[in-house]
Structures are given as structure tokens and as C-alpha cells.
């Protein structure tokens, strides 16, 4: 008695697809040992076509694959494009070689069944719309025609000519002739449902002399299009139920036992359980339209079926697309906090994980908004520049190579609470989802800058410092410069910061900037902030204003400037490569509002940074003579 | 509302056949799960055979005690659902219960993974 269980007997048609699962007993070496599928031979040799290994036969190859589902202790081979050659007896097991546990299977792939030659067959969707073509004599003409649906006992009438209608039928059936045709009648039955299917007799006349026709009405659910997405990743539901009901409201819902439970429409309804990271896009004027969920759990796995519907909600009879998801815990992508907590004037810095082996892609942090059928602007971009409400307090740090890029946002206000997605322009798997939590601050903050009222004097030396507690005594300290593409770092030469200390001196822990002498280049947003290695910590802004010497009063309200000054920046460009790439609009506006819509720019030659390199100030010359000093006391 | 029905329960003696049936109507989804699962006396339900349909591909399970024996069969569209059951024994007495599920995810042989059950028909193999 083997311990592995599958199906033994697997019957399908040929053309069409199969997955079959097979399980296996709950122990970490069967998760983690290898899996196969194998066809046995007359010797009682079994020969391997597909292994968890990577292994995959030429017959199978571009239409099998084999997923292990540890968290499930199940694993899947799907077959598609079966020919009647797939016939026969097979093994799925677990082992390194053929000979370790496994369990027979046996698949019979059968010819599409034929029909008695005088049957017109008629083959259709659930929701989608059949006319039948019923043709007959001259003499016929002006006899009663009629449709009538095979029973057991009798033929139970659909519709006939005299506007009789079966109850059933109401509303969905209609006879009618084509034009001065006077040979041929047609019956339409629109919104087909699993009861329509059978076999239906179309009339004209009555007795011996009647035209007859038998038609065989199938009506197929659509097969389940099988998804397999890692945990933490994005699925992207494509849906295509053509132009007759381009008009009606959309629908996705998953299939609930009973019922099929709606999870977003365009109507507005959407299940809190998808709060944050799910769009609906309708696509075009024929039908189409998608829905894309990000940052999969466990519990997202399942039955999913898109339609449409005037209510928004499943209705029999109407059109659907339906699918399975798998969810698979193995997954590529890091498990990072989907909620990250600030307080209100503080800062947070989220690191975005995107596919390594796509450093060169554009990275991007959008907004999630739930209102309508739900869009994500793009609130800054490697190559987007910061959108004007976010100036001075939202920067991106790209750090190539290694799987990450950080998003800072500071000076936060409970506006800010919210969903953010992480996404590029390559691997949309990679999509992440951020629940920013903003609370109110009961305690000053970390790093503080004095002066707070920050007016340079131009030709001057000025010097603002920024003040930071013990704790961040180990971390790296920098000041930068903010522009809306991004916070360039400013060299920094330490003055004793790395003398060994014993003690912490809670007051005199500060980190400065010099800007000597203060130009008008000079004037905008600077950052103060925290890193160890590659991983950004907290942040605080100040804006520091530039005027010429006078007697008066300062030309800038200080405190309005500390705010939110809005004054046009200017930033040298890094690296000369992307100067010219740097202002482009990105078209076509969609779920990614704001005409900043994510597309795949395709292959970049090279990586395209617009933010400072956070851990270098190579190339980050000055148009100005001023001199940059960090200094540390 | 989900019903199911079962039918063709009765006395047989050992090594003699029987043929159960079971309709299922008002079964929602387009793919579908049905099961039969046998409860002897004082024991738990136990899985006997089950058949899944995905579109135009069937799957049929079996237990290990029936392999053989018995051969379950079923027509989607109609939600029905046959069991075929030879060369009967002792053993092999119980109510047996037809069990639906819209859908075919799970574990065929748990009982917990079918959302919809019959009453029971009853089979006893006796000389």
C-alpha cells in the first residue's frame, strides 16, 4: 500500500489539458526530496518525463511543467495539447530514482466523441448566445415551425412560430426569418446556461412530410485557467468577455462554496480583505478589462471568476472567465513588514524589493487610491520626477545590485496613512504593498536641526546642525540635497566622529553642514539622516532660504519656507547620461494615474539613476564654488 | 438549494453486486467533486470513491479497500453520480453517503473538503 494518493483513472479529450495532483505523507524529507512523473513501459521500466529536478522530456517539452506545494504536501503535473499517444500508465512519486514511493495512474485520452452524421452540433460558452439554423422545404413554407427540446419521454416545445415561448425561455428565445429566405428559419437562445445543453429538434410542417433537424446543444463552463503565483507577489487577472456586454458593470468574485463572493466590481464594491492592493482596469470598448491583486497570502489561493453583469454581481446565464490560483510559499520574493508605523513629523524609510536580475529596471512608488475602480499615481520614480505636493520630504534611493531600492518620505501628517505599492518596469510579480501607518507624536523627535528658521545670507558662511541621540552614535550620519530627482549626498569629511568613546554625551551629539560661501544654488530643501550600510533610517528636512544682504527683513518668512517653500530647485545632473532622459512624461494614463502610468520602457542600457549614489559623493561636483562639510562634535 | 439523493441501497450476500446512484441538483460552478464515503456502525466516515470534473476531463479516486472492486462513474452536466460496487463482504457493510463539492479543491478523501451530503443509503452484505 503506497502512501502516495492521486487519481488513478484520468479521462480527457483529446486537444485538451490535464492536472493532477498527487499527495503525499507530511514529512520534511518528502517536501523537500525530488518529484516525478514517469510512464511505464511494457518491461515495467518507468521512464521519466518530468522531475521536480528540472528534468523535462522531449515530448513534454512547451507543454508540461511539475510544482511541489510543500505547505500543501501535494505536487501538480499538468499536461496540456493531449494527443491519444498520452494514453496509458504512469507514476507520480517521490524519490531520487523511479523506484521510491510513487502511485499508478492511469490517463485515457479519447477522440472528440462523434455524433449521428444528421446531427448539427452546436458548441458554446455559459452567457454567450446560440442561433440555430433549422432549414426546410418550399412546401413548408407556410407551415408552423417550432423548436423543441429533447426529454426522456417527449420533446418538450422551446418556441414556435405561433409566439408560443417555453417559461424558461422567456426573453431569451426568438424565431425569426432572414430576409425573402423562405427555405430556412432560425431560433436564438441568448444567455446560455448548463440546462440549455442537449439535444433539440427543429420543425416545419406536421406528419410525414415535416422537415426535421436534430441539433446537439453543448454548453461548457469554461475550464479554470490554472495560475501559479509565488506568496507576496502580484497576479494580474485578464478578462476577456467580448463585445456583448462591453456596456455592463464587471465583477470579480471567488467562488465561496455556495456562492461566488465579489471581491471588486466597477460599480465601486470591493471586499476589505483586498483594501490596498487591487485595481480594476477596464481595458478597452470590447469587454476587456483586468484586475490586478498584489502582495498575495496564503488565503488568496482558490477559485476566481471575472463577468458581467449590469448589478455588478454573478448572475447565471451572463458570461464568465474563471480561474484557479495557487499560492506557493516558496517564494522569491523577502518577507518584509507590510505595515510600517511613522509619527506625524517623522519619517519612514521603506525598502522596496525588486527582481535582482532586473537592477537596470526603472523602480517606482505609487499611491494606492480606492476611489472608483481604484488607480495608483506615481508619487516618484528613478525616472518621474517627485509630484509637487511631495516636495522636499519624498526621495528615492536606488541601491543597484542588490534587490532593494528605499523610498523615504518625512515630515509626515496623518494624511499620509495609507496604501503604497512598490513596482518597476520589468518583473510585475515583484509588486509589493505597503500599509503606511501614521500616529501622533507624543515625544520630540530623533534628529532635530537648529537653526529652525534657516536664512542664508549669500557670499556668507552658514552652518545648520543637526542634532541626534546616542543610540544612532554607530550609524553613519549624512546631510543631503533634495531635488525632485531625488537627495544627492553631500561629501562629507569626518572631524573625530569614529574616536573611541566610552561614554555618550546626549547633548553634544550633532552632525553639521557648512555652505561656504552660500550661493543661490544654495537655497532649497536639505535632509539630515541615518544609514547603516544600505539601509536608510530616520530623516528630518529643512529648507533653507537664500537672500542678498540687507538691512531689512528677510524677503523669505523663514517659518512659511520650513513648511513647504515652494521655490523652483535646481539640481546638477549625477551622471550626463540622464539628462536628457530625465524630464520624459510617461503616456498613457490608466491605473497609474497622473500620466505617470508604469510601462515597460523596455531594456535599459544602462541603469538609470536619478537619486544620488547614497553611499559615494563620487562625480557629485558643484556648480557653485560653496564647500560641503560634514563635521562631527 | 443543494440536494442529494441517493438511491440502490440494500441486502446482498457476499461476493454479490450492488449499483448505488446519487442526483445531485442545484449544485453550483462549473467544475465539480462527488464522492461516496461509508459509515459502519460506531466507526467514522470513511472515503470509499470520488470523481472530479474540469471541464471535459474527469479524475476518478479510489481507497486502497475498494481498488478493484468497485468503479465509481458520473455524468457532470446531469450531477450524477454511480457506484458500481462487486464481489461485496462483510466489511463492506455501512451507510453509504454521497457527498458534492462545487469545485475541486482539497483533498478528495476528506470529508471535510465536500460542502454538500446526502442522507445515506444503507448496504448490508450478510449470508
Known amino acids: 500500500k503506497s502512501p502516495i494518493f492521486g487519481p488513478q483513472e484520468v479521462s480527457s479529450i483529446e486537444g485538451d489539458s490535464v492536472s493532477i495532483t498527487c499527495y503525499y505523507p507530511d514529512t520534511s524529507v518528502n517536501r523537500h526530496t525530488r518529484k516525478y512523473w514517469c510512464r511505464q513501459g511494457a518491461s515495467g521500466m518507468c521512464t521519466t518525463l518530468i522531475s521536480s529536478n528540472g528534468y523535462l522530456s522531449k515530448e513534454y517539452s512547451g507543454r508540461a511543467n511539475l510544482i511541489n506545494f510543500p505547505e500543501n504536501n501535494t505536487f501538480v503535473i499538468n499536461i496540456e495539447q493531449l494527443t491519444q499517444d498520452d494514453t496509458g500508465s504512469y507514476k507520480c512519486g517521490l524519490g531520487t530514482s523511479n523506484r521510491g514511493l510513487s502511485f499508478d495512474v492511469s490517463l485515457e485520452v479519447s477522440q472528440v466523441p462523434e455524433l449521428p452524421s444528421d446531427t448539427h452540433v452546436y458548441t458554446k460558452d455559459i452567457g454567450r448566445n446560440v442561433t440555430i439554423e433549422c432549414p426546410f422545404k418550399r412546401e413548408n413554407a407556410p407551415s408552423k415551425k417550432s423548436l423543441c427540446k429533447k426529454t426522456n419521454q417527449s420533446c418538450e416545445l422551446v418556441i414556435d412560430s405561433t409566439e408560443k415561448v417555453n417559461p424558461s425561455y422567456i426573453g431569451r428565445a426568438k424565431l425569426f426569418m432572414k430576409g425573402t429566405d423562405l427555405t430556412v428559419f432560425y431560433v436564438n437562445i441568448s444567455h446560455l446556461t448548463h440546462n440549455d445543453a442537449g439535444l433539440y429538434i427543429c420543425q416545419a410542417g406536421e406528419g410525414p412530410s415535416a422537415d426535421k433537424k436534430n441539433v446537439d446543444l453543448q454548453v461548457l463552463a469554461p475550464e479554470p485557467e490554472l495560475l501559479y503565483k509565488d506568496l507576496r507577489s502580484s497576479v494580474t487577472f485578464e478578462c476577456d468577455l467580448g463585445r456583448e456586454v462591453a456596456n455592463e458593470a464587471k465583477y470579480l468574485c471567488r467562488m465561496n462554496k455556495e456562492t461566488c463572493d465579489v471581491i471588486i466590481n466597477t460599480l465601486g464594491k470591493r471586499d476589505p480583505d483586498f483594501e490596498g492592493r487591487i485595481l480594476i482596469t477596464p481595458k478597452d470598448d470590447n469587454g476587456r478589462f483586468s484586475v490586478l491583486i498584489t502582495g498575495l497570502r496564503k488565503e488568496d489561493a482558490g477559485h476566481y471568476q471575472c463577468g458581467a453583469h449590469s448589478s455588478g454581481l454573478p448572475q447565471e446565464g451572463w458570461p464568465i472567465q474563471t480561474w484557479q490560483l495557487f499560492v506557493n510559499e516558496e517564494s522569491t520574493i523577502p518577507n518584509r513588514r507590510s505595515v510600517v508605523k511613522g509619527v506625524t513629523g517623522g519619517s519612514v524609510a521603506i525598502a522596496c524589493p525588486y527582481n535582482p536580475k532586473e537592477s537596470s529596471s526603472l523602480k517606482y512608488w505609487c499611491r494606492w487610491e480606492g476611489d472608483g475602480n481604484g488607480h495608483c499615481p506615481v508619487l516618484v520614480g528613478t525616472q518621474a520626477q517627485v509630484q509637487e505636493e511631495y516636495e522636499g520630504r519624498l526621495a528615492l534611493f536606488d541601491q543597484p545590485g542588490n534587490g532593494t531600492y528605499t523610498v523615504i518620505l518625512n515630515q509626515l501628517t496623518t494624511e499620509d496613512a495609507g496604501f503604497y505599492w512598490c513596482l518597476t518596469n520589468g518583473d510585475s510579480r515583484w509588486r509589493t504593498t505597503i500599509e503606511l501607518q501614521v500616529a501622533e507624536a507624543t515625544r520630540e523627535p530623533n534628529l532635530e536641526v537648529t537653526p529652525q528658521n534657516a536664512t542664508a545670507v549669500l557670499g556668507e558662511t552658514f552652518t545648520v546642525s543637526c542634532h541626534y541621540p546616542c543610540k544612532f552614535y554607530s550609524q553613519e550620519k549624512y546631510w543631503c540635497k533634495w531635488s525632485n530627482k531625488g537627495c544627492h549626498i553631500l561629501p562629507s569629511h569626518d572631524e573625530g566622529a569614529r574616536q573611541s568613546s566610552v561614554s555618550c554625551d546626549q547633548s553634544s551629539q550633532l552632525v553639521s553642514m557648512t555652505l561656504n560661501p552660500v550661493s543661490k544654488e544654495d537655497e532649497g530643501w536639505y535632509w539630515c539622516g541615518v544609514k547603516q550600510g544600505q539601509t536608510y533610517g530616520e530623516t528630518t528636512a529643512i529648507y533653507i532660504a537664500v537672500e542678498e544682504r540687507t538691512r531689512g527683513s528677510s524677503h523669505v518668512n523663514p517659518t512659511d519656507a520650513n513648511a513647504r517653500a515652494k521655490v523652483a530647485l535646481e539640481e546638477e545632473v549625477v551622471d550626463s547620461s540622464i539628462s536628457e532622459k530625465e524630464n520624459k512624461a510617461i503616456p498613457n494614463p490608466g491605473p497609474f494615474a497622473n500620466e505617470r502610468e508604469i510601462q515597460n520602457v523596455g531594456d535599459q542600457a544602462q541603469e538609470n539613476r536619478a537619486s544620488g549614489d547614497a553611499g559615494s559623493a563620487d562625480g557629485q561636483s558643484r556648480s557653485s564654488s560653496s564647500k560641503h562639510h560634514h563635521h562631527h562634535h | 438549494e443543494v440536494q442529494l439523493v441517493e438511491s440502490g441501497g440494500g441486502l446482498v450476500q457476499p461476493g454479490g453486486s450492488l449499483r448505488l446512484s446519487c442526483v445531485a441538483s442545484g449544485l453550483p460552478g462549473s467544475s465539480s467533486r462527488m464522492a461516496w464515503f461509508a459509515q459502519a456502525p460506531g466507526k467514522e466516515r470513511e472515503f470509499v470513491a470520488a470523481i472530479a470534473w474540469r471541464g471535459r476531463t474527469s479524475y476518478k479516486y479510489y481507497s486502497d479497500s475498494v481498488k478493484g472492486r468497485f468503479t465509481v462513474s458520473g455524468d457532470n452536466a446531469k450531477r450524477t453520480l454511480d457506484l458500481q460496487m462487486k464481489d461485496l463482504n462483510p466489511e463492506d457493510t455501512a451507510l453509504y453517503f454521497c457527498?458534492?463539492?462545487?469545485?475541486?479543491?482539497?483533498?478528495?478523501?476528506?470529508?471535510?473538503?465536500?460542502?454538500?451530503w446526502g442522507q445515506g443509503t444503507q448496504v448490508t452484505v450478510s449470508s
Open positions: 457527498a458534492a463539492h462545487p469545485n475541486d479543491d482539497g483533498d478528495p478523501r476528506i470529508s471535510g473538503n465536500y460542502q454538500y
